[in-house]
């Protein structure tokens, strides 16, 4: 449906507001380091263009592209190459190439101050001296440091911040209101972030078929009772809706998936029987609850795929004369009859049968050659449920803290040149996957978990790409994104490395350590414990643990002291030596 | 706690039948699919016949079509295995199983297993 002027179609069909905001994240997650009000200047600047064109698509400009008007209005930007360097070297291309340069120089992990919470009283003050500047900041602040964050779903989360401010600044006890709310969205959302960060990462570096492929295990799994035709066709349309939004063009991405849950919604008689109450709702809402809607019942009976894929004598033939859709059936009839495997094992399982008849539909006798191929399932059904069974022991014995500090060490042992700052943060998040997914009876522990940590493992992989210092890293991020979660677990000790040199300085520790939150206290502990495996990669787990516990307790003895800083410099030099001591240092 | 509890097993002459049959307790019998399985002595253990949940559709190995005929009963939390024509190679410890989702009547799919019913098969 051709239109003579795309950014007044667009107009048209968000409506204002909306397209404010989807151009400001635009524009945020492009140029992350540009100030707040440059920002708003180039929207309003966009905006008021959008709306002569609305009033005469025929006007000057109207007919361009938006990748052409928005990278010129990026373009313009003064400062651009003092602040950004060779990005600015992209304006000099001519679009589509533009627009890939500005998507090339993403930081997903950009120079940004952390994000520091103000007082409620002067939080409130701001929202209700303007309150939709301070959305905007909100918009605005999080897009910048997460430059692949879902657009449409952040219209959401700006929708719910606000909803939050507007009941507790109001409340007898604002904070009281207002912070775990705070808390709860920041959660979510960094969450939500890391999970399209996945889905971005599987479009760019493993192309459409590898994300729909995924789309196709999950639907079906989400979907169990409607037809694969049905399934194939919300997978076409959802592969463009995110293709889209990780490609930066926010205004069709939003449009196109307020399309998809319209239609969803209105067919959904023959796509799922959990989806009334969330066609009630409004279209953010509705959107991300069809996103996060639970697993429909599976059909009262289904038979064995045997019948289908192994016994039939048609099998080589149905897969020469098309082998995805036929490959995609496969998959499809799999993982509506198992809501209990992770998305990625149903696509392991898929790429062996593959494997199999592409070997054996050449063979003499291609039956005979793949009779027995659901029986090569076994091992790799196996193994991630023995992994998980051993990992939720370990969890539940140990509390997530002291979890999290044995993935640590694990990971450190694994991969020790990569910086402790991502390690802290990627086994922080792995060793969050006990108390997510392990209090989940035994049919949902799988896909809770393996997803979770395909999840975090790319987090690992994005920013490793960055700055990659590990060949172990860069081979099991790029060989295969359904075999990174089994490649980084066979990784063992890494022999090669050559142990980090001592450095009294990363063990100082000043009084400052006191005021911090239970969070901040035991990152610091655990940066100090990667670095400890840094310094002695042999060191075994008790000898870590006492140097831990000895850490542990000159902390809360110096807390309790009166002169605390003398405190952290005396007992902090004792306790460098007995550290050393005790590791052999 | 999910029991599964086999019976019928027994010495039979080679051509003669036996009727097995598996009591279900501590589930909720109609969400699973059932099946049977068979280890000879030194053997693996090797699926022999599932039938899904309504009972509506069964798959069975090779080796047993045409002789073998599995069938459940959901009002009596019940699974049958009826064995007819039967050839001393089918000498084994029969044990029952119950799998909550179930694609392709593998082994590894099953949640919950019988202790087994002993058939010899003589010639």
């Known amino acids: 449906d051709a239109h003579k002027s795309e950014v007044a179609h667009r107009f048209k069909d968000l409506g204002e507001e909306n397209f404010k905001a989807l151009v400001l994240i635009a524009f945020a997650q492009y140029l992350q380091q540009c100030p707040f009000e440059d920002h708003v200047k180039l929207v309003n600047e966009v905006t008021e263009f959008a709306k002569t064109c609305v009033a005469d698509e025929s006007a000057e400009n109207c007919d361009k592209s938006l990748h052409t008007l928005f990278g010129d209005k990026l373009c313009t930007v003064a400062t651009l190459r003092e602040t950004y360097g060779e990005m600015a070297d992209c304006c000099a291309k001519q679009e589509p190439e533009r627009n890939e340069c500005f998507l090339q120089h993403k930081d997903d992990n950009p120079n940004l101050p952390r994000l520091v919470r103000p007082e409620v009283d002067v939080m409130c003050t701001a929202f209700h001296d303007n309150e939709e500047t301070f959305l905007k900041k909100y918009l605005y602040e999080i897009a910048r440091r997460h430059p692949y964050f879902y657009a449409p779903e952040l219209l959401f989360f700006a929708k719910r911040y606000k909803a939050a401010f507007t009941e507790c600044c109001q409340a007898a006890d604002k904070a009281a209101c207002l912070l775990p709310k705070l808390d709860e969205l920041r959660d979510e959302g960094k969450a939500s972030s890391a999970k399209q960060r996945l889905k971005c990462a599987s479009l760019q570096k493993f192309g459409e078929r590898a994300f729909k492929a995924w789309a196709v295990a999950r639907l079906s799994q989400r979907f169990p009772k409607a037809e694969f035709a049905e399934v194939s066709k919300l997978v076409t349309d959802l592969t463009k809706v995110h293709t889209e939004c990780c490609h930066g063009d926010l205004l069709e991405c939003a449009d196109d998936r307020a399309d998809l849950a319209k239609y969803i919604c209105e067919n959904q008689d023959s796509i799922s029987s959990k989806l009334k109450e969330c066609c009630e709702k409004p279209l953010l809402e509705k959107s991300h609850c069809i996103a996060e809607v639970e697993n429909d019942e599976m059909p009262a009976d289904l038979p064995s795929l045997a019948a289908d894929f192994v016994e039939s004598k048609d099998v080589c033939k149905n897969y020469a004369e098309a082998k995805d859709v036929f490959l995609g059936m496969f998959l499809y009839e799999y993982a509506r009859r198992h809501p209990d495997y992770s998305v990625v094992l149903l696509l392991r399982l898929a790429k062996t049968y593959e494997t199999t008849l592409e070997k054996c539909c050449a063979a003499a006798d291609p039956h005979e050659c793949y009779a027995k191929v659901f029986d090569e399932f076994k091992p790799l059904v196996e193994e991630p449920q023995n992994l998980i069974k051993q990992n939720c022991e370990l969890f539940e014995q140990l509390g997530e803290y002291k979890f999290q500090n044995a993935l640590l060490v694990r990971y450190t042992k694994k991969v020790p040149q990569v910086s402790t700052p991502t390690l802290v943060e990627v086994s922080r998040n792995l060793g969050k996957v006990g108390s997510k997914c392990c209090k989940h009876p035994e049919a949902k522990r799988m896909p809770c978990a393996e997803d979770y940590l395909s999840v975090v493992l790319n987090q690992l992989c994005v920013l490793h790409e960055k700055t990659p210092v590990s060949d172990r890293v860069t081979k099991c991020c790029t060989e295969s994104l359904v075999n990174r979660r089994p490649c980084f677990s066979a990784l063992e000790v890494d022999e090669t490395y050559v142990p980090k040199e001592f450095n009294a300085e990363t063990f100082t520790f000043h009084a400052d350590i006191c005021t911090l939150s239970e969070k901040e206290r035991q990152i610091k502990k655990q940066t100090a414990l990667v670095e400890l495996v840094k310094h002695k990669p042999k060191a075994t787990k008790e000898q870590l643990k006492a140097v831990m516990d000895d850490f542990a307790a000159f902390v809360e003895k110096c807390c309790k002291a009166d002169d605390k800083e003398t405190c952290f410099a005396e007992e902090g030099k004792k306790l460098v030596a007995a550290s050393q001591a005790a590791l052999g240092l | 706690d999910v029991q599964l509890v086999e019976s019928g097993g027994g010495v039979v002459q080679a051509g003669g039948s036996l009727r097995l049959s598996c009591a279900a307790s501590?589930?909720?019998?109609?969400?699973?699919?059932m099946g049977w399985f068979r280890q000879a002595p030194g053997k693996e253990r090797e699926r022999v016949v599932s039938i899904s949940r309504g009972g509506g559709y069964t798959y069975y190995a090779d080796s047993v079509k045409g002789r073998f005929t599995i069938s459940r009963d959901n009002a009596e939390n019940t699974v049958y295995l009826q064995m007819n024509s039967l050839k001393p190679e089918d000498t084994a410890l029969y044990y029952c199983?119950?799998?909550?989702?179930?694609?392709?009547?593998?082994?590894?799919?099953?949640?919950?297993w019988g202790q087994g019913t002993l058939v010899q098969v003589s010639s």
């Open positions: 501590g589930l909720t019998f109609s969400s699973y699919a």
């Open positions: 199983a119950a799998a909550r989702y179930w694609a392709t009547g593998s082994e590894y799919e099953f949640d919950y």
